[in-house]
Interface confidence: medium
């Protein structure tokens, strides 16, 4: 099943101590999915979308080994035929650097 969209959402972090907010969204025909956020291949957080929503926002507190950095990926799972869990492809990566680049 298709990969989710992933993006960093405001307010953007400006230092290691700031929280990171990462939104992850499944395609329109997969509301209520279970989402997993990975950092460098390690599971950071699990969230389930409400049944009428296609995505979640992961809120990561600053100052911990599980927070700033990256690359972050997300993935979602849905129940398919015969109630078997199906996992999506991984999203594109999102990297977070400090301070947030201004190009």
């Amino acid at each position: 099943i298709p990969a989710p969209s992933i993006r960093l959402v405001p307010p953007y972090p400006s230092s290691q101590e700031d929280p990171i907010h990462i939104a992850c969204m499944a395609p329109g025909n997969f509301p209520g999915a279970n989402f997993t956020l990975y950092r460098g291949g390690q599971v950071v957080q699990l969230l389930q979308a409400p049944t009428d929503q296609r995505g979640v926002t992961f809120n990561l507190s600053g100052g911990s080994s599980k927070a700033p950095g990256g690359p972050f990926h997300c993935q979602y799972g849905v129940l398919g035929e015969l109630n078997q869990s199906q996992l999506s492809d991984l999203s594109e990566p999102v990297n977070v650097s400090f301070p947030v680049p201004t190009w």
């Epitope: 969209s5 993006r7 405001p10 907010h21 025909n29 009428d52 296609r54 926002t57 947030v100």
Partner: antibody, heavy 127, light 107 residues
Framework: EVQLVQSGAEVKKPGESLKISCKGS????????IHWVRQMPGKGLEWMGI????????RYSPSFQGQVTISADKSISTAYLQWSSLKASDTAMYYC????????????????????WGQGTLVTVSS | DIQMTQSPSSLSASVGDRVTITCRAS??????LAWYQQKPGKAPKLLIY???NLQSGVPSRFSGSGSGTDFTLTISSLQPEDFATYYC?????????FGQGTKVEIK
């Protein structure tokens, strides 16, 4: 087929109220946000505001805050834009558009461009 | 509000020409930028989202690039149906804002 169908053109007098509509079909209405965009005659596009039909979360551009109200009735897959007291300067084409959205904490985030648009509703306000 | 400045405001070109339109944001918007095409009397049409992703069904002669504050829409070989007005739009921050538009006319 995804469609957004807007209500027909309106001619109103200054001070009158108005509510125009945007009906979605061909997709799950509560899974996408609805944006409203104004285009005054011969001018560019102006983003007015947004509604998440699933939970009626709204955000307005400061330019339109307090001037219009955006609402939705998910039971009939319809979003609305309304004025309580029209002005001549409200004369414009108004478009609704579908966009990916996500509700996060106390704020909402848009996730991409507006992939489907209504045909537009022309509102003319003249005495 | 984030200001979006497009240039040029209008241009004249011939069929087959390579056309480039630029859009500059007043502050960083990462890659959260879309491009639209609008023809007279019609609703806008999404061409590009996330700065460089081609919307389904849009011809591959359209492409987008850029990140941060500076973005470009390129039409590699202008076709007769491409004469229209083009708008950029940022969706990094509320309120979402559009550029003022670039009108592409026949030379």
């Amino acid at each position: 087929e995804v469609q957004l169908v807007q209500s027909g053109a309106e001619v109103k007098k200054p001070g009158e109220s108005l509510k125009i509509s945007c009906k979605g079909s061909g997709y799950s209405f509560t899974n996408y946000w609805i944006h409203w965009v104004r285009q005054m005659p011969g001018k560019g596009l102006e983003w007015m505001g947004i509604i998440d039909p699933g939970n009626s979360f709204t955000r307005y551009s400061p330019s339109f805050q307090g001037q219009v109200t955006i609402s939705a009735d998910k039971s009939i897959s319809t979003a609305y834009l309304q004025w309580s007291s029209l002005k001549a300067s409200d004369t414009a084409m108004y478009y609704c558009a579908r966009g990916d959205g996500l509700y996060g904490g106390s704020d909402g985030y848009s996730m991409g461009g507006f992939d489907n648009w209504g045909q537009g509703t022309l509102v003319t306000v003249s005495s | 509000d984030i200001q979006m400045t497009q240039s040029p405001s209008s241009l004249s070109a011939s069929v087959g020409d390579r056309v480039t339109i630029t859009c500059r944001a007043s502050q960083t918007i990462w890659n959260y930028l879309a491009w639209y095409q609008q023809k007279p009397g019609k609703a806008p049409k999404l061409l590009i989202y996330d700065a460089s992703n081609l919307q389904s069904g849009v011809p591959s002669r359209f492409s987008g690039s850029g990140s941060g504050t500076d973005f470009t829409l390129t039409i590699s070989s202008l076709q007769p149906e491409d004469f229209a007005t083009y708008y950029c739009q940022q969706y990094s921050h509320f309120p979402h804002t559009f550029g003022q538009g670039t009108k592409v006319e026949i030379k």
